[in-house]
């Protein structure tokens, strides 16, 4: 009489999370009479998955009707598979008894669960960084299996190379997580730029998942300042203009100082956006030259996005000669640049000599 064999034909089975897994098992003989049980794992700590004889196993059903006469097929179907179901499953034949006695085990079938990675979440720096600096973006995705996964970074469609990626845990697990950091050099043209984290996995059928971050949330583009004087008006008033250009974000405060004293403070609001996402703002100050004996030092002081103030000064030279009503008055205007300790780039300092 041939010895009973417990046959598990598949060494491994791979199933997508949410699907059902069929684990096949047949026995080679009706003899001896006794039940089949399914276990996950081997040894004393093994977990009972299905017992044909008794117990309640809501997710497990027998593939063949166990009441079928001469049944030798003890395959099972496990529904709604999750990564936690991964492991090696053993079909074990018992001999009828009180209690039933374990007789023989199948070779085991390893169930691996293909679980999709979660949507990648990209996060940027906690505080803005100035253009021409490098910042780090992180991308995280969780819950995938198997472990093999590909992650790429792009900035405006161009793949980034300064990237460090880790998949955890390093050993065997029911599911895995990936975390990647990309270092991105910010430029003044990056207000409208975007970084994309792209994750490719066997479960995604060639349609990678993407997470994005807008550099507008990470970048600060400092303003250029230029102070200029318009022609003196007939009423001895000089119109001095402070042009603040190419800055981002919009949060900006401008203060005019006359000989060091605050003349006016303004806050930028509702400015039109340049094509590149930056903003421009122009402020002017009318200076009554006849009210001054000495030269007037005008300073345009700009505080942008909470950074140290940047100053641009301009001297209005008041002529020593008496002015005639309605005639041009000569005034020498000298522009100088004064700055606080900041990393802002500015136009070259300029000295303007205007003769009217």
């Amino acid at each position: 009489e041939e010895e009973l064999q417990v046959i598990q034909p598949e060494k491994s089975v791979s199933v997508a999370a949410g699907d059902s897994a069929t684990l096949n098992c047949t026995v080679s003989s009706l003899i001896p009479v006794g039940p089949i049980q399914w276990f996950r794992g081997a040894g004393p700590g093994r977990e009972l998955i299905y017992n044909l004889k008794e117990g309640h196993f809501p997710r497990v059903t027998a593939v063949s009707d166990p009441t079928k006469r001469n049944n030798m097929d003890f395959s099972i179907r496990i529904s709604n598979i999750t990564p936690a179901d991964a492991g090696t499953y053993y079909c074990v034949k018992f001999r009828k008894g009180s209690p039933d006695v374990e007789l023989k085990s199948g070779a085991g079938t390893e169930l691996s669960v293909r679980a999709k990675p979660s949507a990648p979440v990209v996060s940027g720096p906690a505080v803005r960084a100035t253009a021409e600096h490098t910042v780090s973006f992180t991308c995280e995705s969780h819950g995938f299996s198997p472990r093999d996964i590909t992650l790429k970074w792009f900035k405006n469609g161009n793949e980034l190379s300064d990237v460090q990626t880790n998949v955890d845990p390093a050993g065997k697990s029911v599911s895995y997580s990936i975390r990647s950091t990309a270092r991105v050099l910010l430029t003044r043209r990056d207000v409208h730029s975007q970084v994309i984290c792209e994750v490719a996995h066997v479960t995604l059928q060639g349609d990678p998942l993407r997470g994005t971050a807008n550099l507008s949330e990470a970048i600060r583009v400092p303003p250029f300042l230029e102070v200029t004087q318009q022609s003196m008006r007939a009423d001895n008033q000089v119109n001095v203009t402070c042009q603040v250009t190419k800055f981002y974000p919009q949060r900006l405060q401008l203060t005019w100082l006359e000989n060091g004293n605050v003349s006016r403070t303004e806050m930028a609001s509702a400015l039109p956006e340049n094509k590149d996402g930056t903003y421009n703002w122009t402020s002017w100050l009318l200076v009554n030259v006849s009210a001054h004996r000495d030269d007037v030092k005008l300073t345009c002081q700009v505080e942008h996005d909470g950074q140290p103030a940047v100053n641009k000064s301009f001297s209005v030279k008041v002529s020593a000669h008496p002015k005639e009503q309605g005639s041009n008055t000569a005034a020498e205007n000298t522009g100088t640049n004064e700055r606080g300790s900041s990393d802002y780039k500015d136009d070259d300092d300029k000295h303007h000599h205007h003769h009217h």
Epitope: L30, G55, T67, R69
Partner: antibody, heavy 119, light 110 residues
């Protein structure tokens, strides 16, 4: 431990019906056939019928096909055998038995229910 | 229907001696290497107890002095050394078709 507990003895008049119950425990009721067998006093074993509790599929001995009805209540793991139009020669011990090997055999038996048919 | 005929109807054997009971089917009950014959023991006032399944396989807890053999239409239950507790009625049953029982063999001590 598999157990089949049957209902108590019955005395019936000819022409009446009897319904014997068999409550199963110690195993998954829907995974195994239940057989009904009777034994008249001093006589041999006579197979009546069998039922699959999972889907109520039944097989009857032709002798009993018109008079016996097998049912189950899976919520209580109980099998029933009703025998109608009783005659005096239906006096017997009625056994339920479970087929553990799906071989149409009887591995575990209840203790039996004596049904006496007498006018 | 298959008819099972047991012989003898009754049998008296001395303690420690061999007892043999035969069962003949009206047609073959064998296929694919399996013989669909079962043997039961019934003691007075008790339900039957399965002894042997598929002609030659001892059920759980059955002493090994019991054995079964045969194929096709002829089958035998043997008790190699009769014990006092073996006094009972023995039945064969086939499951080639729907179950039927033999008429029984009463075993007594000589």
């Amino acid at each position: 431990q598999v157990q089949l507990v049957q209902s108590g003895a019955e005395v019936k008049k000819p022409g009446a019906s009897v319904k014997v119950s068999c409550k199963a425990s110690g195993y998954t009721f829907t995974n195994y056939w239940i057989n009904w067998v009777r034994q008249a006093p001093g006589q041999g074993l006579e197979w009546i019928a069998m039922i699959d509790p999972s889907d109520s599929e039944t097989h009857y001995n032709q002798i009993f096909k018109d008079r016996a009805t097998l049912t189950t209540d899976t919520s209580t793991s109980t099998a029933y055998m009703e025998l109608r139009s009783l005659r005096s020669d239906d006096t017997a011990v009625y056994y339920c038995a479970m087929d553990y090997g799906s071989l149409y055999a009887m591995d575990y038996w209840g203790r039996g229910t004596l049904v006496t048919v007498s006018s | 229907d298959i008819v099972l005929t047991q012989s003898p109807d009754s049998l008296a054997v001395s303690l420690g001696e061999r007892a043999t009971i035969n069962c003949r089917a009206s047609k073959s009950v064998s296929s694919s290497g399996y013989n669909y014959i079962f043997w039961y023991q019934q003691k007075p006032g008790q339900p039957p107890k399965l002894l042997i399944y598929l002609a030659s396989n001892l059920d759980s807890g059955v002493p090994d002095r019991f054995s079964g053999s045969g194929s096709g239409t002829d089958f035998t239950l043997t008790i190699s050394s009769l014990q006092a507790e073996d006094v009972a009625v023995y039945y064969c049953q086939e499951s080639w078709e729907l179950p039927t029982f033999g008429q029984g063999t009463k075993l007594e001590i000589k």
